[in-house]
Amino acid sequence: KLTIESTPFNVAEGKEVLLLVHNLPQHLFGYSWYKGERVDGNRQIIGYVIGTQQATPGPAYSGREIIYPNASLLIQNIIQNDTGFYTLHVIKSDLVNEEATGQFRVYPELPKPSISSNNSKPVEDKDAVAFTCEPETQDATYLWWVNNQSLPVSPRLQLSNGNRTLTLFNVTRNDTASYKCETQNPVSARRSDSVILNVLYGPDAPTISPLNTSYRSGENLNLSCHAASNPPAQYSWFVNGTFQQSTQELFIPNITVNNSGSYTCQAHNSDTGLNRTTVTTITVYAEPPKPFITSNNSNPVEDEDAVALTCEPEIQNTTYLWWVNNQSLPVSPRLQLSNDNRTLTLLSVTRNDVGPYECGIQNELSVDHSDPVILNVLYGPDDPTISPSYTYYRPGVNLSLSCHAASNPPAQYSWLIDGNIQQHTQELFISNITEKNSGLYTCQANNSASGHSRTTVKTITVSAELPKPSISSNNSKPVEDKDAVAFTCEPEAQNTTYLWWVNGQSLPVSPRLQLSNGNRTLTLFNVTRNDARAYVCGIQNSVSANRSDPVTLDVLYGPDTPIISPPDSSYLSGANLNLSCHSASNPSPQYSWRINGIPQQHTQVLFIAKITPNNNGTYACFVSNLATGRNNSIVKSITVSASGTSPGLSAGA
């Protein structure tokens, strides 16, 4: 079928178009082109006879048309009126006619558009702005761009006039942007230069900085004001309602209490005609006096007296603070603060309450501290300590005992032997003692200020024979690989040799065994379960020797990795499963079982009668020792096969 294709279909003015013929029949006589949708002699453009190759212009020929032997028609320098339909009339040799119609559209090349605006300086939240894309062009599409993005969806944006007009209602400062319009038709697209919308706004409520409102007398006051505004705001300062200056910053050096008051910043926008103000209240404080502490009792007695410390001077509407040992007050039922915090009462003072104590007066700006005060707490005497600690002496040596008791003021000492007063000294010395010097030696300590006395009695034995020793221990149940144990051989005796035996043997050489304190103390570092043995100490001098009863060390250890027995992992269906778990541990571990992760019982033996393949799975034994804080476990896989299906299976228990 004969068809006409227009190339291109949309043609720009001044360009050319080719009406291309497809499926032209064979054996032609000639053909003719007409403007329009039908054959009309008045609208013939050109005719062509094939035999003569002669082209004949028609009434509608404009001189811009060229016809080709293949019947295609080229039209050059296209004008707007060329838009429309074109008909090809083909005359075949048998004089049978055939017709085909084609068409194209002509569009102008668009000029570069521009934006006109009805308001060059709109006011925020008040004005609307209408942008119009110029010129008005037929058959053109209008598009708008904001900051090179397509228009956002907003109820304040409205397109009208075939999208040629963009209206922004109630403009805001955020509408300050680059606006462009674009015109498009099928043959061209052009963008305008950008137009920047200048929205007048503000001033917003000004901000005064710094935010600090409290100042100390003698400081400089430097306030700065800022308000968002377009064009930039003009600033004025008022103090207590009186105009000061028209600057953005207000500076007052060396302020005094008289500079306290309300400071107002006013921001003005000459274009919008709006004013906004912000007020800050500035308080200037005079330097407070340095506080000091008074006490109602300068020499309190421990566990008897209370002490009231008062922070001076008394100032109305002031916050009082306290510190003990350079720390804030600890929470204690013995510490009480008065309602105004000015008085700190220590109930039932102790020797640890000496301080130092400080009080402080707080104003808006800082805290002023008092000088520290230390309490002179009278205490003691505590139970006196008699040294050395020896209780056994050999005849002929000198006995020199010293007494000490914690006390404030220092204690006065007295010595008594078997209840009889000897002397009022801290030390007691007796030379060349005999068995007759055995007895009860009492040290009495007296505090003259508190009137309290305390005594300690020590039994001294003077003998050539040594007593039977005993072993004391600092840790009766040490944990393996963690604890150390110190055994001490009692009593401490002068001119005595100390010896040790383990399981009836002399001490083995080991870096974990250490003797100290004249061999009187035996320390075992990092004890192990193998140290759980019988320990004996012995004492000897030139005339006698004696041994202690044995002490067995109870070492806590484990639990070690448990062992599940029997080792079999394959069983026949119908057999009994009898698993026993064992782990070395002291104390004995707590046992528990899990089958396929599900907790079972807390026994050492797990028994399941007549097992089936349903009993397949993982059997875990868990062991726990709360004394060592350690846990351990082992997992065993059990496979149960139907009877006779697999060789080498255990028949079970």
């Epitope: 571990p589 046992y591 019982q601 033996v605």
Partner: antibody
């Protein structure tokens, strides 16, 4: 479910002996140790000792050593506690109780108690 | 033998109150401590073992804490059915010993 059922109340004269039984069911008898605890009227709980039903091993409180004997019969899943040389202060409810597991566990199931009255 | 000392020997509290009972061992028993509840005329019931492990089926308002020598049983919100005598017991080797008991009543 686990059950410990004890024998009935007994009245004995001073110097006599009493044997209280405790039949276990609902679990594997030999897997759990069984303890005996007594409670005098209006008083607290006092541990007497335990038996390992699997081995027959017993462990008695020093206070009852020499007067108490614990035995077991695995064929009937029963344990027995015999207390001899009874005196009036032995009047109490005697409980058997199962240990929750083996070694250093507390007592999770208790029998209903057997009242033993010692009176002349 | 390890001695177990309970306090108080008795207490009276209102429904919904938080109740605390303490138990002290004469020597270190680590975490081997159990708590029992005995209602009048009934057998003792195990509540807690290993100082803090709640036995299955025991209400979560019961909790235990402590280690070494000092232990606590807490009832977070006392209920009428909690009226009973509570005993602590060490299970750190034999002989097992019990505290003397704490009688809990409702005001």
């Amino acid at each position: 479910q686990v059950q410990l059922v004890q024998s009935g109340a007994e009245v004995k004269k001073p110097g006599a002996s009493v044997k209280v039984s405790c039949k276990a069911s609902g679990y594997i008898f030999t897997s759990y140790w069984l303890h005996w605890v007594r409670q005098a009227p209006g008083q607290g709980l006092e541990w007497i000792g335990y038996i390992n039903p699997n081995t027959g091993y017993t462990n008695y409180s020093q206070k009852f050593q020499g007067r108490v004997t614990m035995t077991r019969d695995t064929s009937t899943s029963t344990v027995y506690m015999e207390l001899s040389s009874l005196r009036s202060e032995d009047t109490a409810v005697y409980y058997c109780a199962r240990e929750y597991g083996n070694y250093n566990y507390p007592l999770d199931y208790w029998g209903q108690g057997t009242l033993v009255t010692v009176s002349s | 033998d390890i001695q177990m000392t309970q306090s108080p020997s008795s207490l009276s509290a209102s429904v919904g109150d938080r109740v605390t009972i303490t138990c002290r061992a004469s020597e270190n028993i680590y975490g081997y401590l159990a708590w029992y509840q005995q209602k009048p005329g009934k057998v003792p019931k195990l509540l807690i073992y290993n100082a803090k492990n709640l036995v299955e089926g025991v209400p979560s308002r019961f909790s235990g804490s402590g280690s070494g020598t000092d232990f606590t049983l807490t009832i977070s919100s006392l209920q009428p059915e909690d009226v009973a005598t509570y005993y602590c017991q060490h299970h750190y080797g034999t002989p097992y010993t019990f505290g003397q008991g704490t009688k809990v009543e409702i005001k």
